[in-house]
C-alpha cells in the first residue's frame, strides 16, 4: 500500500508480487519523487484500492498503456 | 491456453479433511488468481474463496471462513483446497476456476472433484 | 455483498422459441469509467463444470452461438435465446465480478416444453 508520510509526498516502499487484472484498474499515477526510495506506480481500482507497482514490470507498463487507450478513447 | 486439472473423488466421513488439488499448465500459477467454487447436488454455484491480488491475500466467503484453507505450490503450479470438520452438507463437486491477465472473469474452470461426506 | 437474483426459477420453452432469463443485483456492477458491466453468464450441463457464454454482460464467448445474447447494465441484466434449441437445455447462470465477494444468481433451469 502506499504511504504519505508527509502530505502531499506519497511513496511506495513495497511492490505487489502478482499481476492485477488489468480490468480492475480504473487509473494510476506515477511516483517519481526524490522524496522516495524508489520509482513506482500507483494503480486505482475500480473499487478504489490503491496499489504499489513496479515501473519495470512488463504487466505494469502494458496496463498503463492499456489506461492510456482508455482515457483517450471517448465514450459513446 | 490455461488448463486446470484436478484430483480425483473422495469419500470422507464426517468430522474429518478433505484436500482437493488443481494442476495449472499453460500459465504459471503465480500470474492467475486461482479460485475456488462448490456445487452441492442439484443445488447452485458457490464462490468459496480466492486470491485476491488487490489485498494481496486469499480472501473466504464468510460463510467457509475458519474451516477453508487455500495455499499454492508455486514449485508446481499446483493450488490446494482444504476444508476440515467435513459434514455432510458439504457433499459437493469443487471446482477450480481462474482468470487470465486481460479478462477478470472465470474463463477457465477445472472439471471438478467430487466430495462425499458419509459415515 | 452484492446479491445476484435470477428470475425465474426455471422455465420450459418450445424449440425455436425465445427464452428470457433476468439477472437483477443489489447494487450496481457497472463501472462509469470504462462503461462496463462486471458480468458474467454461464451455461452448466449436468456432469460439466460451468461453460463461459457472455462476458462483460453482452459480449458473447468465442464459439457460443449468435442465438444467445445478453444484455443491459448496472442492476439489471438479460441473457436471451432467440430461438430455442435441443442443446440449449440447461441451468444458467449470472455472475458479478464488480466486487469480492464474487456472487452467483442462483441458476435458472431451461427446458424444452
Known amino acids: 500500500q502506499p504511504d504519505a508520510i508527509n502530505a502531499p509526498v506519497t511513496c511506495c516502499y513495497n511492490f505487489t508480487n502478482r499481476k492485477i487484472s488489468v480490468q480492475r484498474l480504473a487509473s494510476y499515477r506515477r511516483i517519481t519523487s526524490s522524496k522516495c526510495p524508489k520509482e513506482a506506480v500507483i494503480f486505482k481500482t475500480i473499487v478504489a484500492k490503491e496499489i504499489c507497482a513496479d515501473p519495470k514490470q512488463k504487466w505494469v507498463q502494458d496496463s498503463m498503456d492499456h489506461l492510456d487507450k482508455q482515457t483517450q478513447t471517448p465514450k459513446t | 491456453q490455461v488448463q486446470l486439472v484436478q484430483s480425483g473423488a473422495e469419500v470422507k466421513k464426517p468430522g474429518a479433511s478433505v484436500k482437493v488439488s488443481c494442476k495449472v499448465s499453460?500459465?504459471?500459477?503465480?500470474?492467475?488468481?486461482m479460485h475456488w467454487v462448490r456445487q452441492a447436488p442439484g443445488k447452485g454455484l458457490e464462490w468459496m474463496g480466492g486470491?485476491?491480488?488487490?489485498?494481496?491475500?486469499?480472501i473466504y466467503a464468510q460463510k467457509f471462513q475458519g474451516r477453508v484453507t487455500m495455499t499454492e505450490d508455486t514449485s508446481s503450479d499446483t493450488a490446494y483446497m482444504e476444508l476440515s470438520s467435513l459434514r455432510s452438507e458439504d457433499t459437493a463437486v469443487y471446482y477450480c476456476?481462474?482468470?487470465?491477465?486481460?479478462?477478470?472473469?472465470?474463463?477457465?474452470w477445472g472439471q471438478g472433484t467430487l466430495v462425499t461426506v458419509s459415515s | 455483498d452484492i446479491v445476484m437474483t435470477q428470475s425465474p426459477d426455471s422455465l420450459a420453452v418450445s424449440l425455436g422459441e425465445r427464452a428470457t432469463i433476468n439477472c437483477k443485483s443489489s447494487?450496481?456492477?457497472?463501472?462509469?469509467?470504462?462503461?462496463?458491466?462486471?458480468l458474467t453468464w454461464y451455461q452448466q450441463k449436468p456432469g460439466q463444470p460451468p461453460k463461459l457464454l457472455i462476458f462483460?454482460?453482452?459480449i458473447r464467448e468465442s464459439g457460443v452461438p449468435d442465438r444467445i445474447s445478453g444484455s443491459g447494465s448496472g442492476t439489471d441484466l438479460t441473457l436471451t435465446i432467440s430461438s430455442l434449441q435441443a442443446e440449449d437445455a440447461a441451468v444458467y447462470y449470472c455472475?458479478?465480478?464488480?466486487?469480492?465477494?464474487?456472487?452467483f444468481g442462483q441458476g435458472t433451469k431451461v427446458e424444452i416444453k
Open positions: 462483460w454482460a453482452s
Open positions: 476456476a481462474t482468470h487470465e491477465f486481460w479478462s477478470g472473469y472465470f474463463d477457465y
Open positions: 499453460g500459465y504459471t500459477l503465480t500470474d492467475l488468481s
Open positions: 455472475q458479478q465480478y464488480y466486487s469480492s465477494p464474487w456472487t
Open positions: 447494487q450496481s456492477v457497472l463501472f462509469s469509467s470504462n462503461n462496463k458491466s462486471y
Open positions: 486470491f485476491d491480488p488487490e489485498d494481496g491475500e486469499t
